[in-house]
């Protein structure tokens, strides 16, 4: 039969399994919510066509269904900072574009662990930032719809 | 159905300047960037510069960077390149052209206006 | 400054491919536009975002980019397919947009 002492270490690491699992699905959230942003932004702006940001080649990961593959969208932050900076007009501002890449480069690394020795096997189509974010926000979506609620 | 028409070419002393416009009809005027590209008699495509469609971003070309302009007047749904310091080599067809589907291509372009550098 | 460059001319029999590249530095990390020029007339974008075809144009164009060349593919070349083509993209800093040569593609008769 399981002493008590067992079953309280099996239940706390439970608790912290579930805890962990909570803060996984909110930095999910948050990175959803960030690369949403992102696009919608992108979107307004493309369509006031002074359309620099589509020359870009941004590249894609083969495949992505692990957190891990999320080192391909770290992979391509610089280039996005640079879209960014490129740019800024009246029609389309953001205040902070360092820190908002910032932001998404923290909470992919929270997310994916530190790790950088998994390296990201990109496709040979490119896309352009557009197609960028929505591929990595289809990412973010199927897994917070497959994670445990 | 979008017109682009350039005027304000013709032959001009070196050294004089010259206004260059481009009316355009058929399409949100405001809504887009436009770009200024250029071709020498018998020569290739040379871009020129760019605006963007609200005429705060502005980029041009080495070869005249500091003496050219562009701007625009979105009530007027027209472009414009001031052109000072004009040189021999400036000679050319100037094309006014804009981006209007969702690439980055210049889809749509003017019938242009022949600027001619001599003494 | 920033350069693409193309072969100057290109020459195929009616009914051939002809291929006309377009080489440059930043192209692994730039698109890369196509334009045809006939006499006498203004430019017309053909490809767009490397392998992408404006409505319009034929099928018997297309696109394609590898590493620092990008490559204009005309299959089955006629004569109205006779023109200048440019490249088009823009520089490492994304700021200044940049025309190749241009190529002259001549269809022996």
């Known amino acids: 039969a399981p002493t008590s002492s067992s079953t309280s270490s099996s239940t706390a690491e439970a608790q912290q399994q579930q805890q962990q699992q909570q803060q996984q699905q909110q930095h999910l959230e948050q990175l959803l919510m960030d690369l949403q942003e992102l696009l919608s932004r992108m979107e307004n702006y493309r369509n006031l066509k002074l359309p620099r940001m589509l020359t870009f080649k941004f590249y894609l990961p083969k495949q992505a269904t692990e957190l891990k593959d999320l080192q391909c969208l770290e992979d391509e932050l610089g280039p996005l900072r640079h879209v960014l900076d490129l740019t800024q007009s009246k029609s389309f501002q953001l205040e902070d574009a360092e820190n908002f890449i910032s932001n998404i480069r923290v909470t992919v690394v929270k997310l994916k662990g530190s790790d950088n020795t998994f390296e990201c096997q990109f496709d040979d189509e490119s896309a352009t930032v557009v197609d960028f974010l929505r591929r990595w926000i289809a990412f973010c979506q199927s897994i917070i719809s497959t994670s445990p609620q | 159905e979008v017109q682009l028409v350039e005027s304000g070419g013709g032959l001009v002393q070196p050294g004089r300047s010259l206004r260059l416009s481009c009316a355009a009809s058929g399409f949100t005027f405001s809504y887009y960037g436009m770009h200024w590209v250029r071709q020498a008699p018998g020569k290739g495509l040379e871009w020129v510069a760019d605006i963007s469609n609200d005429g705060s971003n502005k980029y041009y070309a080495d070869s005249v960077k500091g003496r050219f302009t562009i701007s625009r007047d979105n009530s007027k749904t027209t472009l414009y390149l001031q052109m000072n310091s004009l040189r021999p080599e400036d000679t050319a067809v100037y094309y006014c052209?804009?981006?209007?589907?969702?690439?980055?291509?210049?889809?749509?372009w003017g019938q242009g206006t022949l600027v001619t550098v001599s003494s | 400054s920033y350069e693409l460059t193309q072969p100057p001319s290109v020459s195929v029999s009616p009914g051939q491919t002809a291929r006309i590249t377009c080489s440059g530095d930043a192209l692994p990390k730039r698109f890369a536009y196509w334009y045809q020029q006939k006499a006498g007339q203004a430019p017309v974008l053909v490809i767009y975002?490397?392998?992408k075809r404006p409505s319009g144009i034929p099928e018997t164009l297309s696109g394609s980019s590898s590493g620092t060349t990008a490559t204009l593919t005309i299959s089955g070349a006629q004569e109205e397919d006779e023109a200048d083509y440019y490249c088009?993209?823009?520089?490492?800093?994304?700021?200044?947009?940049?025309f190749g040569g241009g190529t002259k593609l001549t269809v022996l008769g």
């Open positions: 975002e490397d392998n």
């Open positions: 052209a804009t981006p209007y589907y969702d690439s980055s291509g210049l889809d749509y």
């Open positions: 088009y993209s823009t520089d490492n800093t994304g700021g200044l947009w940049v």
